[in-house]
Every structure is written in C-alpha cells, then in structure tokens.
Interface confidence: low
C-alpha cells in the first residue's frame, strides 16, 4: 500500500460509507435477516475523553484487536450465509465488500505501524481485555463495523497521522 494512504480522510470515509450502505440494505436491526448463530464482535463504545488522553500506542492495541475480531466475525457471517438456503445477492455483495474493506484497512494500518504495538504493547500486563458483545442479525454486525470505523479507527488514525506529520 502507498505510504500513509490511510491519512487521506477520503480513504477511510469511503469504507465508512460502504459499511453504512451495508447496514441500510439489511432493512433495520429488528426485522432484518438474522444470523443462524450469535457472533462475537468488538464493543464499539468509546469514552471520547478517556480515549483522547490515551497514548497512541494504547489506542493502536485496541484498534488492532478490534479489527482482528471484526474480520473474524464477518468471515464467520460469510460462512453462515453460504450455508443458508437462498442467500440474498445484495447481502452477499456487502459481506464480500466488508471482507475486502477490512483486508485493505489492515494493510493500510500496517503501513502506519499499528501492528507493531500489538507485538509489544506498552504495559502489556495492564492492558485491559477487549470488551465484546454479540450480534444476532446482519444489521447489528454491519452497525458494529460502521461504528468501529467511525469511532476507534477514525480517532486512532487521526491522531497517528497527526503524530507522523510532526
């Protein structure tokens, strides 16, 4: 990946909009298509004020762990969807787009150096375990995807890119 492409806000915005389109196509979280089993996903909640005061290395750990779990979750959803009778074409398309998007974002973050922090996180003994929740519909899964990109990922890349510019 070209160096620091993730620092161009339009790149991340494209993936966020794709994620929101996927959420919209699933017809709402109450009545939309359900997953045949619950899938573990990262909790996207972010305490803005606490996050803002975290070291960028600590943010990187949370982002990387969340991205890994999210990738596993969407791959799991793809497998469940493949085993279902008559999977809707549009849903399949958005799952494929999400998988492709997460792979691209993972590559872009590697260039930014986020995975280095996971290998040797600061104060590893004190690092809080990643909070998780479960998704039982495709809508909830895509909402978590969208919220993760708009939340922790966007906040982290904004700060990491600012640091890199100094």
């Amino acid at each position: 990946a070209p160096p620091r492409l993730i620092c161009d806000s339009r790149v991340l915005e494209r993936y966020i909009l794709e994620a929101k389109e996927a959420e919209n196509v699933t017809m709402g979280c109450a009545e939309g298509p359900r997953l045949s089993e619950n899938i573990t996903v990262p909790d996207t909640k972010v305490n803005f004020y606490a996050w803002k005061r975290m070291k960028v290395e600590e943010q990187a750990v949370e982002v990387w762990q969340g991205l890994s779990l999210l990738s596993e979750a969407i791959l799991q959803a793809q497998a469940l969807q493949a085993n279902s009778s008559q999977p809707p074409e549009s849903l399949q398309l958005h799952i494929d787009k999400a998988i492709s998007g997460l792979r691209s974002l993972t590559s872009l973050l590697r260039v930014l150096g986020a995975q280095k922090e996971l290998m040797s996180p600061p104060d590893a003994t004190q690092a809080a375990p990643l909070r998780t929740l479960t998704a039982d519909t495709f809508c909830k899964l895509f909402r978590v995807y969208s919220n993760f990109l708009r939340g922790k990922l966007k906040l982290y890349t904004g700060e990491a890119c600012r640091r890199g510019d100094r």
Epitope: E13, I16, L17, K20, V46, N47, F48, R150, K154, G158
Partner: antibody, heavy 127, light 108 residues
Framework: QVQLQQSGPGLVKPSQTLSLTCAIS??????????WNWIRQSPSRGLEWLGV?????????DYAVSVKSRITINPDTSKNQFSLQLNSVTPEDTAVYYC?????????????????WGRGTLVTVSS | SYVLTQPPSVSVAPGKTARITCSGD??????VEWYQQKPGQAPVLVIY???DRPSGIPERFSGSNSGNTATLTISRVEAGDEADYYC??????????FGGGTKLTVLG
C-alpha cells in the same frame, strides 16, 4: 434528575469580561463520567458551542477555535458549579448563554450529546 | 470550518410525516444529533448517534444519516411538535457544529 441553574449579569460593557456560573444538582462537577459545557445562541450566529471542562483524574478542557484566546471555563468543587469567563467582549458576543451536561461512554458521538441544559441567560454587550 | 446546512422552514399537516434534512460534506461519516427548541426554552435532545432516542422521546421521532445528508423524521405530526429543530455534529476534535435550524410549522 440532573438540574443546572445559571446565574450572572445580563448586561456587560464592551471590552469587559462576561462571567456566568452554572450550579449543578443531581451530579458532581468532578464526576468521572460527565462533562460540562457552555453553548450560546444568537440570531446572527445561531447555536454555537464554546467549550467544555471535565475531570478524569485531573481537570481537562477544550475550547472552540472561535473563542479560544478569550475563554476560560473553571470548576468550583466546593460549590459544585462551573463558570464561564469570556474576555474582551464586543456587541457580537450578545447572546443567550446556556450551560449543558454531556455524558461520555456511548458509541462515539453520544459523549457529545447535550442531554441536560440550563434555562439560559440573555447577556447583552452594550455601553 | 465545517458547515451543516438545513432548510429554514418545513410545513406539514397534522398526522402526516415531516422530514427535516441536514447536509454537510461526508456527513455520513460523522455522528449526528437533533435538538428541538420551543420559543423561550432551552433545546431538548431528541436524537443522538444518528438514530438513537433518549428516554422520554416518542417513537414518532427517528433519524438516519448517510452520504452527505442526515434526516430527522417525525411521523404522525402533532401540533405540539411545532418548534425549531437543529442538527449538530462533532466534525473535529474539539468543535461541535450546529446547523442553522429549521422551523417546523404544523398547518391548520
């Protein structure tokens, strides 16, 4: 139920300092889960967020770019209130000033939602 | 600086659906809130995080946000819904941005 009670003068002379206070009941100004904001509203500028103060092991603040050089928001833990000071005011600063509480911890965005507001204080800047 | 644009006014008949829009560059990538303000009163939060309702806000109020536009939808409009409505978003680290406001008039 959180309540915010505002007080301060309604008339300030140009070049002087605008000072307002917001007394909190139902919560603590030094709560680790809340943030305390000032927002103003005028016909010419609409609603305008001015700044925030919050406590997370120590005190932090953030101010709007438009007033950064003139604004100070301070806590008063003994009285459970917080104050706004805006220096070197001009008639452009004439507005209804509101204090408001926001709560962090939801999906990103929720911490900015102003769920509780004071009633507002009309401040006129005039000689 | 970031700008949120709202129509100055929207009119709707009682019982019908009102839609108030808020547009900004790539607004769908930010979170949007909506506030209702009646004359002489402080604003009241009716929607946060694009589409969530605080407790006490009727289900008739809903929100969405995609692309460049966020929309506040009020179904089965009542006379008591007549007010000014403001969208807001935190588009940067420190600044909250409010839209210019939309006056909702309930006809009849």
């Amino acid at each position: 139920q959180v309540q915010l009670q505002q007080s301060g003068p309604g008339l300030v002379k140009p070049s002087q300092t605008l000072s307002l206070t917001c007394a909190i009941s139902g919560d603590s100004v030094s709560s680790n889960t809340a943030a305390w904001n000032w927002i103003r509203q005028s016909p010419s500028r609409g609603l305008e967020w001015l700044g925030v103060i919050y406590y997370r092991s120590k005190w932090y603040n953030d101010y709007a770019v438009s007033v950064k050089s003139r604004i100070t928001i301070n806590p008063d833990t003994s009285k459970n209130q917080f104050s706004l000071q805006l220096n070197s005011v001009t008639p452009e600063d004439t507005a209804v000033y509101y204090c408001a509480r926001s709560v962090p911890g939801g999906d990103p965005g929720l911490e900015h939602a102003f769920a509780y507001w004071g009633r507002g204080t009309l401040v006129t800047v005039s000689s | 600086s970031y700008v949120l644009t709202q129509p100055p006014s929207v009119s709707v008949a009682p019982g019908k659906t009102a839609r108030i829009t808020c547009s900004g560059d790539n607004l769908g990538t930010y979170y949007v809130e909506w506030y209702q303000q009646k004359p002489g009163q402080a604003p009241v939060l009716v929607i946060y995080d694009d589409s969530d309702r605080p407790s006490g806000i009727p289900e008739r109020f809903s929100g969405s946000n995609s692309g460049n536009t966020a929309t506040l939808t009020i179904s089965r409009v009542e006379a008591g819904d007549e007010a000014d409505y403001y969208c807001a978003s935190f588009a940067s680290w420190s600044d909250s941005v409010f839209g210019g406001g939309t006056k909702l008039t309930v006809l009849g």
